[in-house]
């Protein structure tokens, strides 16, 4: 009778991970006796996968029963498949001895490759906040797919983006794989309600790839203009000056008026109006009691914008052709832009 | 967690035995080959010995027909038992597990073997 | 049998320095080559195998490259805590298990 053959028909075999993967092998004869193991490597080292006769192999399953006396099926099924489990697996027959079984000849081995879906990229920008005209670098990182194979693209309100670098670590074989990409992104002024998309396609996503974003509202800063103008004569020795602060973002301000660089009041943002573009606009208002004052006066607003250095922009209150009032101590009634006096 | 604890270190005359074992845990043990790598003092990392899932045995020259390794799989412990010790064999000796891909993955924090006369 | 030599014996380095550590094959070994740190008192640990590749936990600061006979190791930016032993093995299916001589890293 010819002699037995471990029989292993499949060079490889890709599952995807969370799957069940099906190890086939069959024998050629019944002869010699002995069990049928399963390792994973081929050294040695070998660990040990299935063992017919003992042994806790709680994710193995055999496709027949080993028990019956004709089967010559040592084909298993290993559940849950994780990338950790990629390895060439051998089949080998054993011939029973004592005190122990010999190994009697093994099957060709099975490569089991296993994909693995990319876990959902992860945006992230630049730690601090920037004005529009600087570039600012955002990073999208995503981890545990297989094979190495992956497609990465960047976004900007929909626009793709050309200017970024993309690493896939490790360059050589392994279990799973991880990518990065760092992308350049010009801020302009119109940002507040920009995204950029990091898209990441994968063998594994049919696809349908996945999607990470980052929005520009927690990057941008957009620096406040100032404009001070002088209203109307309000009563016969009031003047209003408001300061118009336009186009910030975000919302975070202090303002403070200065009367001939005497601070007069300072206030923060409150009741902001938004623009479409998503930035905020603000106006303050100073009412200057011009009687309480001999020679004109310099009126300063003073804006500090995010924690950032103060901006300001001046205006000269020309006081000589107003009568002066005796006995008037105040020399401004302080107004916010919620229209209540502050006396 | 997997741990790997050596015992059974200690100071022996050249020419006298000494047997060591490995506990471990954390691991179905009988599904991988385990090993004894030494290192002796101020020096490399040296292979001694390993013992397949089907307890077939492998040794490094220098200790080939002296040492014997076993493993008990119902109680989870690698041994190596040493004869006729020599000054060159005082050494750490870290018990390790291999993977299917011949990489010591998980080391024991050692014993200390020490022969002198 | 193959020969692991690693080179320099030891390497005099301050935080924040670049490491490159050596290690050749006295024959090609394609690129099953394994890295390993070993912290005085301690056992080693388990760093890159197969070249390139990171075993779980290792931060991205160390990484290896390399293949045939010349095998690099390469720790951007040293940390205090990288400073240790390094030894390169073989992985080859079958005993004997090949360690090479380490190279020392050190605090200069």
């Known amino acids: 009778e010819e002699e037995l053959q471990v029989i292993q028909p499949d060079k490889s075999v890709l599952v995807a991970a969370g799957e069940t993967a099906t190890l086939r092998c069959t024998a050629t004869s019944l002869i010699p006796v002995g069990p049928i193991q399963w390792f994973r490597g081929a050294g040695p080292g070998r660990e040990l996968i299935y063992n017919q006769k003992e042994g806790h192999f709680p994710r193995v399953t055999t496709v027949s029963d080993l028990t019956k006396r004709n089967n010559m099926d040592f084909s298993i099924r290993i559940g849950n498949i994780t990338p950790a489990d990629a390895g060439t697996y051998y089949c080998v027959k054993f011939r029973k001895g004592s005190p122990d079984d010999v190994e009697f000849k093994s099957g060709a081995g099975t490569e089991l490759s296993v994909r693995a879906k990319p876990s959902a990229p992860v945006v992230s920008g630049p730690a601090a906040r920037a004005t529009p005209q600087h570039t600012v670098s955002f990073t999208c990182e995503s981890h545990g797919f297989s094979p190495r194979d992956i497609t990465l693209k960047w976004f900007k309100n929909g626009n793709e983006l050309s200017d970024f670098q993309t690493n896939v670590d490790p360059v050589g074989e392994s279990v799973s794989y991880s990518i990065h990409s760092t992308a350049k992104v010009v801020l302009t002024r119109e940002d507040v309600h920009s995204q950029v998309i990091c898209e990441v396609a994968h063998v594994t996503l049919q696809g349908d790839p996945l999607r990470g974003t980052a929005n520009l509202s927690e990057t941008i800063r957009v620096p406040p203009t100032l404009e001070v103008t002088q209203q109307p004569v309000r009563a016969e020795n009031q003047v209003n000056v408001t300061c118009q602060v336009r186009k910030f973002y975000p919302q975070r301000l202090q303002l403070t008026w200065l009367e001939n660089g005497n601070v007069s009041r300072t206030e923060t943002a409150s009741t902001v109006t938004e623009n479409k573009d998503g930035t905020y606009n603000w106006m303050s208002w100073l009412l200057v009691n011009v009687s309480a004052h001999r020679d004109d006066v310099k009126l300063t607003c003073q804006v500090e914008h995010d924690g950032q250095p103060a901006v300001s922009k001046s205006h000269d209150l020309k006081v000589s052709a107003h009568p002066k009032e005796q006995g008037s101590n105040t020399a401004a009634e302080n107004t916010g832009s919620n229209e209540r006096n502050i006396y | 967690d997997v741990q790997l604890v050596e015992s059974g270190g200690g100071v022996v005359r050249p020419g006298e035995s000494l047997r060591l074992s490995c506990a471990a845990s954390?691991?179905?043990?009988?599904?991988?080959?385990m090993n004894w790598v030494r290192q002796a003092p101020g020096e490399g990392l040296e292979w001694v010995s390993l013992?397949?899932?089907?307890?077939?045995?492998y040794y490094a020259d220098s200790v080939k027909g002296r040492f014997t390794i076993s493993r008990d799989n119902s109680k989870n412990t690698l041994y190596l038992q040493m004869n006729s010790l020599r000054a060159e064999d005082t050494a750490v000796y870290y018990c390790a597990k291999v993977t299917w891909n011949n990489l010591f993955d998980y080391w024991g924090l050692g014993t200390l073997v020490t022969v002198s006369s | 049998e193959i020969v692991l030599t690693q080179s320099p014996g030891t390497l005099s380095l301050s935080p924040g320095e670049r490491a490159t550590l050596s290690c050749r094959a006295s024959q090609p070994i394609d690129s099953y080559l394994a890295w390993y740190q070993q912290k005085p008192g301690q056992a080693p640990r388990l760093l890159i195998y197969n070249t390139v590749t990171r075993a779980t936990g290792i931060p991205d600061r160390f990484s290896g490259s390399g293949s045939g006979t010349d095998f690099t190791l390469t720790i951007n930016r040293l940390e205090p805590e990288d400073f240790a032993v390094y030894y390169c093995q073989h992985q080859y299916d079958w005993p004997p298990y090949i360690f090479g001589g380490g190279t020392k890293v050190e605090i200069k």
């Open positions: 954390g691991f179905t043990f009988s599904n991988f080959a």
């Open positions: 013992i397949s899932v089907t307890a077939t045995t």
